[in-house]
């Protein structure tokens, strides 16, 4: 079953590497668990970033040693990517899973390009 | 494409029983989704009466108290509603639906109306 | 339960008109509202859900917004086969309710 997926056409990351945008699905009722990962398209190559499980009314849990945090409210999933560098630039898709009850819905994002500056080195000073 | 079809009586006594059944057709009903009943009262009024999952798990609408019984015949593709001690206030159309869980309905049955009256 | 108000019962409207109906909730429902078009002798369509997502094969005329408590369906450019009668549906939360309705008429 297909869902609308909602996100930020574009997004520029802060002078620290971090990026945040909103993930909404268009929720057909209250799936009790929903599956939200983040695939980053570059150069026609896509490769998940991170993924996370989570029950309805819980924190969404990455791994550990995950780049990304985020939070859920209601069918809204609040993203952030930390640790970004200007090479990471590129198009992050919100993929959105309603894992349980069934049936299964997907919903693919159109993505959101964050652009990624490095910071200038700060001079030298005497 | 799904499809839900009631039948059943059109016509009650008060203090007696009604039973109506929902037909669905074009997804097996132990696939997914909730299967629900709706009755709307002359004046266009709507009330949810209750469910039965996919899993066979049940919940019903608590001003309805223990009237109603929701069940299913898996084989038939079919569920049903048994109504207790209905009176005058029972005088609707119902119609069955379906949604996902804690959700909007996206398939109804066309209604059948029910008359309570001795 | 959660009582969703339709405060008007009828709306009177011209072909060509925009017009607003609304539904307020007596509690927080976030976006979990849904609306329906209703005409005599049919079953209720769905038309939005998730607040203002619209159903499949649904005209763009139809358009739905608010969150929390307030609701509004606003249909543009109203065509006469639009006059019927506007459920909006909370489900949030169980026992699943419904406002009483908002019929649209021909002025």
């Known amino acids: 079953k297909a869902m609308h997926v909602a996100q930020p056409a574009v997004v520029l990351a802060s002078s620290r590497g971090i990026a945040s945008f909103v993930c909404e699905y268009a929720s057909p009722g209250k799936a009790t668990e929903v599956r939200v990962t983040v695939l980053r398209q570059a150069d026609s190559q896509v490769t998940e970033v991170c993924a996370a499980t989570y029950m309805m009314g819980n924190e969404l849990t990455f791994l550990d040693d995950s780049i990304c945090t985020g939070t859920s409210s209601g069918n809204q999933v609040n993203l952030t990517i930390q640790g970004l560098r200007a090479m990471d630039t590129g198009l992050y898709i919100c993929k959105v899973e309603l894992m349980y009850p069934p049936p299964y819905y997907l919903g693919i994002g159109n993505g959101t390009q964050i652009y990624v500056i490095d910071p200038e080195p700060c001079p030298d000073s005497d | 494409d799904v499809q839900l079809q009631e039948s059943g009586q059109g016509l009650v006594k008060p203090s007696q029983s009604l039973s109506l059944t929902c037909s669905v057709t074009g997804y097996s009903i132990t696939s997914g989704y909730y299967w629900n009943w709706i009755r709307q009262f002359p004046g266009n009024k709507l009330e949810w009466l209750g469910y039965?999952?996919?899993?066979?798990?049940?919940y019903y609408n608590p001003s309805l108290k223990n009237r109603i019984s929701i069940t299913r015949d898996t084989s038939k593709n079919q569920f049903f509603l048994k109504l207790n001690s209905v009176t005058s206030e029972d005088t609707a159309t119902y119609f069955c639906?379906?949604?996902?869980?804690?959700?909007?309905?996206?398939?109804w049955g066309q209604g059948t109306t029910l008359t309570v009256s001795s | 339960d959660i009582v969703m108000t339709q405060s008007q019962k009828f709306m009177s409207t011209s072909v060509g008109d925009s017009v607003s109906v609304t539904c307020k909730a007596s509690?927080?429902?976030?976006?979990?509202v849904a609306w329906y078009q209703q005409k005599p002798g049919q079953s209720p369509k769905p038309l939005i859900y998730?607040?203002?997502y619209r159903y499949s094969g649904v005209p763009d005329r139809f358009t739905g917004s608010g969150s929390g408590t307030d609701f509004t369906l606003t249909i543009s450019n109203v065509q006469s086969e639009d006059l019927a009668e506007y459920f909006c549906?909370?489900?949030?939360?169980?026992?699943?309710?419904f406002g009483a309705g908002t019929k649209l008429e021909l002025k």
């Open positions: 998730s607040t203002s």
């Open positions: 549906h909370q489900y949030d939360t169980y026992p699943l309710t």
């Open positions: 039965i999952g996919y899993d066979g798990s049940n």
């Open positions: 509690q927080n429902v976030g976006t979990y």
């Open positions: 639906a379906r949604n996902y869980y804690s959700g909007y309905f996206d398939f």
